[in-house]
């Protein structure tokens, strides 16, 4: 059947191959992450919701944006806990193959959704700062809503692998079933194809269309700054400006990496199994920092404005918000939010507080 | 990328033998647990036999003693030799490659077709 040298071959192999990223840690240290992941993810973003909704009362461009980032986020965050008790159970799946679906393309869902709502937030805080006047049109909230249903229709649609190649296999002659991704001959080549979208449009696209558009916010307020020379200059927006561009860079790069390793992997590039086993090993670690910083970004972006801020710490303290309507023009705007009155242009007017929650 | 081709199968009478093969094109890793399944008609796909990249060996319960799985790491090849062969074998027998970590995967073949008939 096999002579000895192969059998020796195979042997030698197999003692260079580790377990496949199936190391005892990981059982562990993977579902504690998940769990935290879960807690204050689901807290945080219900309280966003909550407090764009209810107590902001959704007046404005990017708090839609902000609102379904959130949301998107809570549909991610419910099936965590599936994805906890499969890692502690060592990648065994209990809740069939109906949740293995579900529960896979809500993990490809979030990536997408989140990842267009957030270039989406750059793009509006791009229109809103730079170009307000000419953008008062555009940036209306039916414009918002409209994004946001065909950024939700395309995240569904970049999912459907996932509900479609997702099941649950029965390992061998045991009752164990792992929820696997599974490929006939004549598909084959769609792992790698998922991997590199997940690379190109989940990454690479945002992230430069985000980065033109901090660039050029940038630009537009120092320019700004520079023809009032005797009002003092705020960092703070800038330093705002990198946090947010680096947040999203260093949250996502990890797993968009090891995303790409795996690709290599597969299409026999890298046939090295340690770093194979470092990639196994990795991928959950990177989508736990990954997913963690993505349930953050709600908060992360609400607390740029103070009034977010007030209300959020308002409804920590149970007080109810006010039965009236805020006042607010519709004009003015959440995250970064930028008064139109005030013209980047203008030499007469101090720059916008243009990162605030309106 | 993963490509699993069976050859082999065909129409052989109760008590006789086949062999299986299965080519892996693309590279299949050691860390690929190579197996082959069967679907009967009108019943579900079962688990038949694997084979771990260290040569370890699993079979189902109704073909043990009958059937061997064996595999050639240089080849990239899966072999099913099958043995005294029944009626209850008649079945499309596919070749499966699948590992079971953070994000497993189950490649399958197009499948070979074995009648057992005399």
């Known amino acids: 059947i096999l002579n000895s040298s192969t059998e020796d071959g195979i042997k030698r192999i197999q003692d260079d191959c580790p377990k496949a990223g199936r190391h005892n840690y990981i059982f562990v240290m993977i579902p504690t992450l998940y769990s935290i992941i879960f807690v204050v993810g689901i807290f945080g973003n219900s309280l966003v919701v909550i407090v764009i909704y209810f107590y902001m009362k959704l007046k404005t461009v990017a708090s839609v944006f902000l609102l379904n980032l959130a949301l998107a986020d809570l549909c991610f965050l419910l099936t965590l806990p599936l994805w906890a008790v499969y890692t502690a159970m060592e990648y065994r799946w209990p809740f069939g193959n109906y949740l293995c679906k579900i529960a896979s393309a809500s993990v490809s869902f979030n990536l997408y959704a989140s990842v267009f709502l957030l270039t989406c937030l750059s793009i509006d805080r791009y229109l809103a700062i730079v170009h307000p006047m000419k953008s008062r049109l555009r940036r209306t909230m039916l414009v918002a809503k409209v994004t946001c249903i065909i950024i939700w229709l395309l995240a569904g649609l970049a999912s459907l692998p996932a509900i479609i190649h997702r099941n649950v296999f029965f390992i061998e002659n045991t009752n164990i079933t792992v929820c696997a991704f599974h490929y006939e001959s004549q598909n084959s080549t769609l792992p790698i194809g998922l991997g590199l979208t997940k690379n190109i449009l989940g990454f690479l696209f945002p992230f430069l269309i985000i980065l033109t558009s901090y660039t050029l916010i940038w630009k537009a307020l120092k320019k700004a700054y520079e023809i009032q020379k005797n009002k003092p200059r705020n960092d703070d927006i800038f330093k705002i400006i990198m946090a947010i561009v680096l947040f999203f860079f260093f949250s996502w790069i990890p797993h968009q990496i090891f995303t790409f390793l795996d690709v290599l992997i597969q299409l026999g590039i890298i046939r090295d199994c340690r770093i194979a086993d470092i990639v196994d090993t990795a991928m959950p670690i990177t989508i736990c920092i990954a997913y963690f910083n993505n349930c953050l970004n709600p908060l992360f972006y609400g607390f740029l404005g103070k009034k977010f801020k007030r209300y959020f710490l308002q409804l920590l303290k149970y007080i109810p918000p006010k039965a009236k309507s805020h006042s607010n023009l519709s004009t003015k705007m959440s995250t970064l939010s930028y008064r139109p009155s005030d013209n980047v242009s203008s030499s007469t007017k101090k720059p916008a507080p243009c990162f605030e929650v309106e | 990328e993963v490509q699993l081709v069976e050859s082999g199968g065909g129409l052989v009478q109760p008590g006789g033998s086949l062999r299986l093969s299965c080519a892996a094109s693309?590279?299949?890793?050691?860390?690929?647990?190579m197996g082959w399944y069967r679907q009967a008609p009108g019943k579900g796909r079962e688990f038949v036999a694997a084979i771990s990249g260290g040569s370890s060996t699993n079979y189902a319960d109704s073909v043990k003693g009958r059937f061997t799985i064996s595999r050639d790491n240089s080849k990239n090849t899966v072999y099913l030799q099958m043995n005294s062969l029944r009626a209850e074998d008649t079945a499309v027998y596919y070749c499966a490659a699948y590992k079971i970590d953070s994000n497993p995967r189950v490649y399958w073949g197009q499948g070979t077709q074995v009648t057992v008939s005399s």
């Open positions: 693309g590279y299949i890793y050691s860390r690929y647990r």
